[in-house]
Interface confidence: medium
């Protein structure tokens, strides 16, 4: 066969790299959904209503035995792991506020229990889920966490959470309406990465045979023209372009990506990206927890506790 030329080796290297990249994209993110928080900070005046929102992103398994447990709770700042401590929201535990359904389905918490506390959590068909807090007081200020657990038949499979800050203000400095601050660009980049990975997964699966064919043809053409390529290698090697690996120009179309801009917030329902409003009709009833029920005050495993499995 002889020693491969620089071009042949190069084209094969590109092919292998493309193959590896698409294989990784195809296999990598299949199981991993994410939670995005469109806004990381909500600043509201006392007495106002606010809707905190999270969004389920990425591939969602719609298997018959797969359901999603979505809930809300409060946590505290300065922890090693954000959202690891689970505190109630207005005396309602995350169990009281939970939604349960398959995939991107709509759901609501029971009205009677939550509404007595001025709360309502809801979920729509597009992966958005939210908690609405009515008549805010200074005591409502703090870190809020949304949690999504994928459950296959009884057992938990995958767990993700999102965090956001609520600041309730009073006095002359308080805004007249809620003001929301978008999540930092890093969060956005992570979300974009998740979306891209999902896209790459689909593209990867579709393009894999095409890439393999191209690589094979490249190799064949390269070996057939080895003599000519050796002669003209110096002049051609700098002209090799691979559209799949062009350096991306700086994103000029996104101004002030690193700056957090407050957005005026109308204190009703948060619309979803599709323009639809979150559902407000009650879905399935949820009884308040009885005295014998288990709670999950923290993520620390409880030794030999038979009533639950800490996830």
């Amino acid at each position: 066969m002889g020693v491969p030329t620089a071009l042949e080796a190069g084209s094969w290297r590109w092919g292998s790299l493309l193959f590896a990249l698409f294989l990784a994209a195809s296999l990598g993110p299949v199981a991993a959904f994410k939670v995005a928080t469109p806004y990381s900070l909500y600043v509201c005046p006392e007495g106002q209503n606010v809707t905190l929102t999270c969004r389920l992103l990425g591939p969602v398994d719609k298997g018959h035995d797969v359901t999603f447990y979505k809930t809300w709770y409060r946590s505290s700042r300065g922890e090693v792991q954000t959202c690891s401590e689970r505190r109630p929201i207005r005396n309602l535990t995350f169990q009281d506020l939970h939604l349960h359904h398959g995939g991107h389905q709509a759901a609501n918490t029971s009205h009677d229990l939550a509404q007595r506390h001025g709360l309502e959590s809801a979920s729509d068909h597009h992966g958005n889920f939210s908690i609405t807090m009515r008549n805010l007081t200074l005591l409502d200020s703090g870190l809020y966490c949304c949690l999504v657990v994928e459950i296959r038949h009884h057992h938990s499979e995958h767990r993700v959470h999102g965090a956001m800050e609520l600041q309730v203000q009073t006095g002359k400095d308080a805004p007249s309406n809620c003001v929301v601050y978008p999540s930092s660009s890093q969060d956005s980049e992570n979300i974009t990465a998740a979306a891209l990975a999902t896209g790459a997964c689909i593209v990867g699966i579709l393009c894999l045979p095409l890439i393999l064919l191209l690589v094979y043809k490249q190799r064949q053409a390269a070996s057939n023209r080895r003599a000519q390529e050796l002669v003209r290698m110096d002049s051609n090697i700098q002209g090799i372009e691979n559209p799949g690996f062009e350096a991306s120009p700086p994103a000029q179309g996104i101004p002030e990506a690193k700056v957090r801009h407050p957005l005026s917030y109308v204190a009703q329902r948060q619309p979803s990206e599709s323009g639809r409003h979150l559902l407000s009709e009650p879905s399935t009833p949820l009884s308040p927890p009885g005295p014998g029920d288990v709670f999950f005050p923290s993520l620390d495993p409880v030794p030999d506790s038979p009533n639950f499995e800490v996830i």
Epitope: T67, H100, H101, H154, H155, S156, E157, S287
Partner: antibody
């Protein structure tokens, strides 16, 4: 304490249906799975299926699909299992049992009912 | 379906002796979340089953420490260190990792 009270024994004709009940007390009915298990002499225990009353989800053993229908009434904290097109093969003791907590359970059945005997005979 | 095979079918013991019951699954019962949902139940004559052990080796609340579970993958064992009269009955192993959950055929613990 946590209890599951099952309905009494049933003597039914072949080809008919029967609906047996399981009333839960001592815990929040909507927060736990509730399963059904069949026991026939010489056949051991068989999982029929389970229901999550809080969301109305059901899981069935393929073997019992079309035979058993699981429902729950959250207002009375009662689960039901209807068995249709009964034959002598359906003569057995049927247990209801509380499954794990919805949010990632460690086990299947921690509390069992006393069982309901169903006899199919002409 | 995952087939759970228990041995022996019958286990005659003297009170105070150690008893050991084996349970083998037809495939690995490690759940995709990393846990192994293998349980042991005891059914006394005329009663409903009672949970003894969950997740291979965890004793359920109120279960005496003479009961212990062990094993991994496809092979599991229940040991009773000193058999008492109240331990007599049929022992069932059960897997909850795969749908449908399945029980073993049972092992009858009886007095020799």
């Amino acid at each position: 304490q946590v209890q599951l009270q099952q309905s009494g024994a049933e003597l039914v004709r072949p080809g008919t249906s029967v609906k047996i009940s399981c009333k839960a007390s001592g815990y929040t009915f909507t927060n736990y799975w509730l399963g059904w298990v069949k026991q026939r002499p010489g056949h051991g225990l068989e999982w029929i299926g389970d229901i999550y009353p809080g969301g109305g989800y059901t899981n069935y053993n393929e073997k019992f699909k079309g035979k058993a229908t699981l429902t729950a009434d959250t207002s009375s904290s009662t689960a039901y299992m209807q068995l249709s097109s009964l034959t002598s093969e359906d003569s057995a003791v049927y247990f209801c049992a509380r499954g794990g907590y919805y949010y990632g359970s460690s086990w299947y059945f921690d509390v069992w009912g006393a069982g309901t005997t169903v006899t199919v005979s002409s | 379906d995952v087939l759970m095979t228990q041995t022996p079918l019958s286990l005659p013991v003297s009170l105070g002796d150690q008893a050991s019951i084996s349970c083998r699954s037809s495939q690995s019962i490690v759940h995709s979340n990393g846990n192994t949902y293998l349980e042991w139940y005891l059914q006394k004559p005329g009663q409903s089953p009672k949970l003894l052990i969950y997740k291979v080796s965890n004793r359920f609340s109120g279960v005496p420490d003479r009961f212990s579970g062990s094993g991994s993958g496809t092979d599991f064992t229940l040991k009773i260190s000193r058999v008492e009269a109240e331990d007599l009955g049929v022992y069932y192993c059960f897997q909850g990792s795969h749908v449908p959950p399945t029980f073993g055929g049972g092992t009858k613990l009886e007095i020799k």
